[in-house]
């Protein structure tokens, strides 16, 4: 994360800034939600542990046509060091549990806020 470019400035961005921007975007999504987020699309639940960003991307990348989460997908793509494509799954998914995108975003937001408070930026 320390070398992530292209967040708000041309150079590398501190991990705390990157994490804070992702949190702000997820807050924005939850606050501005009117109709069912992404038409009620369902995604695989994930283990909120190590490798969380790639796992979150692997889940959310299977949602297309949802403008509300496009920026989140871009951010997670920046956080995840390897190439992720739709239909790709890792062991980080809870493969027997699907939840609505809205719930997924809320769960991810709560976890990221916890990490931020604890200073776990990497």
């Amino acid at each position: 994360l320390t070398c992530l470019g292209g967040f708000a400035s041309p150079g590398p961005v501190p991990p705390s800034t990157a994490l804070r921007e992702l949190i702000e975007e997820l807050v924005n999504i939850t606050q501005n939600q009117k109709a069912p987020l992404c038409n009620g699309s369902m995604v695989w639940s994930i283990n909120l542990t190590a490798g969380m960003y790639c796992a979150a991307l692997e889940s959310l990348i299977n949602v297309s046509g949802c403008s509300a989460i496009e920026k989140t997908q871009r951010m997670l793509s920046g956080f995840c060091p390897h190439k992720v494509s739709a239909g790709q799954f890792s062991s980080l998914h809870v493969r027997d549990t699907k939840i609505e995108v809205a719930q997924f975003v809320k769960d991810l937001l709560l976890h990221l806020k916890k990490l931020f408070r604890e200073g776990q930026f990497n």
Partner: antibody, heavy 118, light 111 residues
């Protein structure tokens, strides 16, 4: 399989409006965005606008005042309406599906030819 | 709006040689470490076909002769070696900022 098919009037008189329908199959409009792109004869591609699966609409800013994009999810149809047509609006009009992230246009219709002439 | 300028407007390349097409953006098309720049091929009488997404990722089914590179404002599409079937017009397109835009196109002729 994924298919998109445009249908339009072919000939439109100057100052009149153009209506084109894009009928899709093999995917749901609630889950994918659809773009409109046009190509004047012998020239390049121009992006007109798009409608996302969740209903957000983006337009080419230079044409925004003349364009309207809508859809009917139940009929699997996307509609383009353009007002005040002039001869330089003549060309081929394509609809194209947005794929998954990063939202490049992965499937295209064959296009429908539009001629603006009196 | 981001303006994409392609060069050259046309080029002729001998069979088996390398074709290089450039696309320059008026401002960065990078976001969160990725380049939102895609390449399409269009043959006469056909709709465009997606070749490369995110500057360097080959779309499924596209031959490995095609490759893309670049970041921020400067991008390149390379076809090596060129085959007869590659005669077409190639377009870059961005979806990073504001309205999506296409480059003006580069027509490739095979000698």
């Amino acid at each position: 399989q994924v298919q998109l098919k445009e249908s339009g009037p072919g000939l439109v008189a100057p100052s009149q409006s153009l209506s084109i329908t894009c009928t899709v199959s093999g995917f749901s409009l609630t889950g994918y965005g659809v773009n409109w792109v046009r190509q004047p004869p012998g020239k390049g591609l121009e992006w007109l606008g798009m409608i996302w699966g969740d209903e957000r609409i983006d337009y080419n800013s230079a044409l925004k005042s003349r364009l309207s994009i809508t859809k009917d999810n139940s009929k699997s149809q996307v509609f383009l309406k353009m007002n005040s047509l002039q001869t330089d609006d003549t060309g081929r009009y394509f609809c194209a599906r947005d794929g998954y992230f990063p939202y490049a246009m992965d499937y295209w219709g064959q296009g429908t030819s539009v001629t603006v002439s009196s | 709006n981001i303006v994409l300028t392609q060069s050259p407007a046309s080029l002729a390349v001998s069979l088996g040689q390398r074709a290089t097409i450039s696309c320059r953006a008026s401002e960065t098309v990078d976001s969160y470490g990725k380049s939102y720049l895609h390449w399409y091929q269009q043959k006469p009488g056909q709709p465009p076909k997606l070749l490369i997404y995110l500057a360097s990722n080959l779309e499924s089914g596209v031959p490995a002769r095609f490759s893309g590179s670049g970041s921020r404002t400067d991008f390149t599409l390379i076809i090596d070696p060129v085959e007869a079937d590659d005669a077409a017009t190639y377009y870059c397109q961005q979806n990073n900022e504001g309205p999506r835009t296409f480059g003006g196109g580069t027509k490739l002729e095979i000698k």
